[in-house]
């Protein structure tokens, strides 16, 4: 069975949890001191306060903490105030600010570019496999298979627009019905949320930063998973998305519009096209069962081609094989017919690094995957550092207040909806929900944006990406217009339905609580973040895919018991926290289960042992490598050369859940500077405001 976070002998305390309104921080519960727990199941366990049962945060025993880990850190100012500076100091400060802004924009640029190249790398590594997923005939009859194909394909190509466009072309070619396409679109929505989760992994170096960043990223995942969990059965039963979108498409006489404006691509494309250029049509062709496409490379070689349509004479076995009776003749021996042939003449080669290497797609993809992840990680570290040095004191206060404060009463409820609109607008501008949510992740990590505020921004991002799809659909050629518009609208209404489910009533904002719970677990056991990623985005979809291929009977035979066990556990959990007296004594806690089934501790020991052999070698490579090491091996002394792990762990070695108090350093975002990883800046020259 999959590892569970610790489930102790916990009793609820209803008075201790106060749910904050939207945008507010939940009040930290008073946590009583806890005796050191041993792995002995029979040992007495001190009671701790728990959040309500509907929160995943209840699944982790947290020891005494100075502060609520979800409270935003205080970004204190260590520099000299502007008014106290002389003219020279002011000029120097101004240019420092300009310099920082340029650096920040530069790293942001390369961050977005690396996301684009990461997507290309994934397409090179798994694009053809992704295309083959689509050519499975069972998609038509099995919505669950459609869903996991949507997830897997989007994860493999790192782009929901690519998987959606494949679906559109399949629908317009009548290879797929709109009904069968809807679950795939839902899956694509889930798959696209992996990008910012990967970005969150890069912030693994600092526990509290990672806690927030990972929770901020996975709030997107949980929203999508929960929406699918509710809306897929509803759609299968009622076909409401199909019906609504069909009515809209039929009631309007749409004329072909113009392409959605590529605003961010205009800036990033000149750089990314120098690295690699892909022929994305190949994936679509594979999806549409084109045998020739399977041998084609995704790496674009020729960028300028001349296509000439000519008619050529070809021999046919018999007159029955002729194009038409009038286009049939004989030379006395063979039968001939005329066929239209598109002759493509290559004129100019593309200008990118891999154009003349003639490497296999997998090799190019692997190279780009490693490089883009390194650049992504490097840029992220630098963005966090620069933001940390800029967002201090007054600046931080203003930004945090602006972003996280609600409108005055009675309009406080409108704030979240404005955030949804902002998220949608920003995503529309950058033309990618992955880019927007990935940019949001480090900001959540360093404590500029709360998860409560990031949630509506993420929901808005989901809407924004569908409006882009609607615009792209309106620009489709005549034959694809109807199908692409209907699918884009299905995507849109699916996200709207999800928002209506999981946003308007604060009680229903389950994704926030689930993400915080996962953030807590991942901060304690950082390997669990990778485990979560693999399980939710690869293993579960692949298992469902495999079972679906085996047939409905196998899928139901395995699925029903699994779902039954999950429901049973959830019901038991609910009863344990709400009314434990109804349960027999043995079932009032999880102690009846072996430790490995109710705690991650034994699993942690296994993972630590497994990764132990890599510790010494990997850490000395570089800081980036060290971060990867810290992610895998929760080790206090793994880094001998670089101190990035060692120092962070030192103060917390004795604790069960090492979470650094935000006040420990002047500025949490540059705490590593204060710790000696980088020489601390001289406070005299430190510029705090732009």
């Amino acid at each position: 069975m999959a590892p569970w976070p610790e489930l102790g002998d916990a009793q609820p305390n209803p008075d201790k949890y106060l749910e904050g309104a939207a945008g507010q921080q939940p009040t930290a519960p008073d946590k009583s001191k806890e005796t050191n727990k041993t792995d002995n199941t029979e040992a007495p366990v001190t009671k701790i306060e728990l959040l309500p049962s509907y929160s995943t945060a209840t699944l982790i025993d947290e020891p005494t903490e100075v502060d609520d880990p979800w409270n935003l850190p205080t970004l204190q100012d260590s520099g000299i105030k502007w008014s106290e500076r002389d003219t020279k100091g002011k000029i120097l400060c101004f240019f420092q600010g300009i310099g920082r802004l340029i650096l920040l924009l530069g790293f942001l640029y390369f961050f977005v570019c690396s996301l684009d190249i990461l997507s290309s790398a994934f397409q090179l590594v798994g694009g053809k496999m992704a295309g083959q997923f689509f050519s499975n005939s069972s998609i038509m009859s099995n919505p669950l298979l459609g869903l996991v194909i949507g997830v897997l394909v989007t994860v493999l190509v790192q782009s929901s627009s690519t998987s959606t466009s494949i679906v559109v072309s399949m629908v317009s070619s009548s290879l797929l019905t709109v009904r069968a396409a809807i679950p795939i679109i839902m899956g694509a929505n889930i798959g696209t949320s992996i990008t910012n989760t990967i970005v969150a992994l890069m912030q693994v170096g600092d526990r509290s930063e990672f806690r927030r960043a990972f929770a901020g990223a996975t709030v997107h995942d949980f929203f999508n998973w929960l929406s699918v969990l509710v809306l897929l059965p509803v759609e299968v039963a009622t076909h409401y998305l199909e019906i609504i979108t069909q009515l809209i498409v039929e009631s309007f006489h749409f004329k072909n519009g113009e392409d959605a404006p590529d605003l961010l691509k205009v800036i990033t494309k000149p750089f990314t096209k120098l690295i690699v250029q892909l022929d994305k049509k190949v994936i679509s062709q594979i999806a549409m069962n084109d045998e020739k496409a399977k041998n084609k490379s995704l790496v674009k070689i020729w960028c300028k081609t001349f296509t000439n349509k000519t008619q050529i004479n070809v021999t046919v076995p018999s007159t029955a094989n002729c194009t038409s009776p009038s286009l049939c003749w004989t030379d006395g021996i063979q039968n001939w017919t005329m066929k239209n042939v598109t002759y493509k003449e290559n004129i100019a080669k593309c200008q990118h690094i891999f154009v003349n290497f003639h490497l296999p797609d997998l090799a190019v993809g692997t190279i780009l995957l490693i490089l883009s992840l390194l650049v992504l990680c490097g840029c992220l570290i630098m963005i966090v550092k620069i933001l940390g040095s800029v967002l201090k004191g007054q600046v931080a206060t203003v930004i945090k207040k602006t972003i996280n404060t609600d409108f005055p009463f009675p309009f406080a409820w409108l704030t979240g909806y404005l955030a949804i609109l902002v998220g949608a607008g920003m995503t529309f501008i950058v033309q990618s929900s992955s880019v927007f949510t990935s940019a949001l992740t480090p900001l959540i990590g360093i404590g500029v944006i709360t998860i409560e505020r990031a949630y509506p921004l993420t929901l808005g991002s989901n809407i924004g990406t569908t409006t882009t799809a609607i615009l792209a659909a309106l620009a489709s050629p005549g034959n694809a217009l109807r199908s692409s518009l209907q699918i884009a609208l299905c995507h849109f209404f699916f996200n709207i339905s999800g928002i209506l489910l999981w946003y308007p009533i604060p009680f229903t904002r389950l994704p926030i609580r689930m993400a915080k719970g996962l953030g807590n677990i991942s901060a304690k056991y950082r390997w669990f973040a990778v485990f979560y990623l693999i399980i939710f985005f690869f293993l579960i979809p692949l298992t469902v895919f495999g079972l679906s291929l085996a047939g409905w009977r196998v899928l139901v035979g395995v699925g029903v018991p699994v779902v039954f066990i999950i429901i049973l556990v959830l019901c038991l959990r609910l009863l344990q926290s709400r009314c434990p007296r109804v349960l027999p004594k043995k079932l009032q806690n999880w102690n009846f289960l072996p430790l490995w089934m109710r705690s991650l501790k034994p699993w942690d020991a296994v993972v630590s042992k497994f990764t132990g052999c890599f510790q010494m070698r990997c850490c000395c490579c570089c800081r980036v490598c060290c971060r990867a090491c810290c992610l895998l091996c929760d080790c206090p002394k793994c880094c001998r050369c670089s101190k990035c792990c060692e120092d962070l762990e030192e103060a917390q070695e004795g604790q069960d859940v090492p979470v650094k108090a935000p006040e420990t350093f002047d500025n949490i975002t540059i705490s590593r500077e204060a710790q000696g990883e980088v020489p601390a800046s001289d406070s005299k020259t430190e510029c705090t405001a732009l």
Partner: antibody, heavy 120, light 107 residues
Framework: QVQLQQSGAEVVKPGASVKMSCKTS????????MHWVKQAPGQGREWIGA????????SYNQKFKGRATLTADKSTSTAYMELSSLRSEDTAVYYC?????????????WGQGTSVTVSS | DIQMTQSPSSLSASVGDRVTITCKAS??????VAWYQQKPGKVPKLLIY???TRHTGVPSRFSGSGSGTDFTLTISSLQPEDVATYYC?????????FGGGTKVEIK
């Protein structure tokens, strides 16, 4: 220039066989299809069949299938047609012809014809 | 087999006259039709193929038209050397078949 030289006139008895030749020059023998056409006096023309000397592939008019045999000798650039089980209605002039207009059955070079008379 | 019916079987016209010979196919042959000229005691000569394409060396007064089942050979201005028998032929299907011929004479 392209030339097709056919063998001389033949007088044969009913039931017998006749083998006529068509010697070519002025072009690559294996390039073009060789057609054989029958023209009976006072009647229309009939296509007997064709052979592609390059591969030896043949095609026949069902009416003549089994009685006509087309062959080609690449070494001498000569095409042959053998007509068996002759009857009086086989009395005609037989032409060999080639089509240099690739992929078409429009023949543009003809031999002078071989006259075959079937009489007892 | 595809039958090619030629009409008229013979015609007489003055020098300079416009002469039209028609050929009707029993089924659609597209444009796979050729026209031949055979002068008495001579071998046939290809005039037109693909319904309207003149063969090398054929005077421009000869033209062809039609498609499907109806085809026409036109001599825009009859000349004394045009006295001959004209045959149409289809090469759309095996066996290749010829029309019965049209004998053209000068009045």
């Amino acid at each position: 220039q392209v030339q097709l030289q056919q063998s001389g006139a033949e007088v044969v008895k009913p039931g017998a066989s006749v083998k006529m030749s068509c010697k070519t020059s002025g072009y690559t023998f294996i390039t073009y299809n060789m057609h054989w056409v029958k023209q009976a006096p006072g009647q229309g023309r009939e296509w007997i069949g064709a052979i592609y000397p390059g591969s030896g592939d043949t095609s026949y008019n069902q009416k003549f299938k089994g009685r006509a045999t087309l062959t080609a000798d690449k070494s001498t650039s000569t095409a042959y047609m053998e007509l068996s089980s002759l009857r009086s209605e086989d009395t005609a002039v037989y032409y060999c012809s080639i089509s240099t207009i690739i992929t078409t059955g429009a023949v543009d070079y003809w031999g002078q014809g071989t006259s075959v008379t079937v009489s007892s | 087999d595809i039958q090619m019916t030629q009409s008229p079987s013979s015609l007489s016209a003055s020098v300079g006259d416009r002469v039209t010979i028609t050929c009707k196919a029993s089924q659609d042959v597209g444009t796979a039709v050729a026209w031949y000229q055979q002068k008495p005691g001579k071998v046939p000569k290809l005039l037109i193929y693909w319904t309207s394409t003149r063969h090398t060396g054929v005077p421009s007064r000869f033209s062809g038209s039609g498609s499907g089942t109806d085809f026409t050979l036109t001599i825009s201005s009859l000349q004394p050397e045009d006295v001959a028998t004209y045959y149409c032929q289809q090469y759309s299907r095996i066996p290749l078949t010829f029309g019965g011929g049209t004998k053209v004479e000068i009045k």
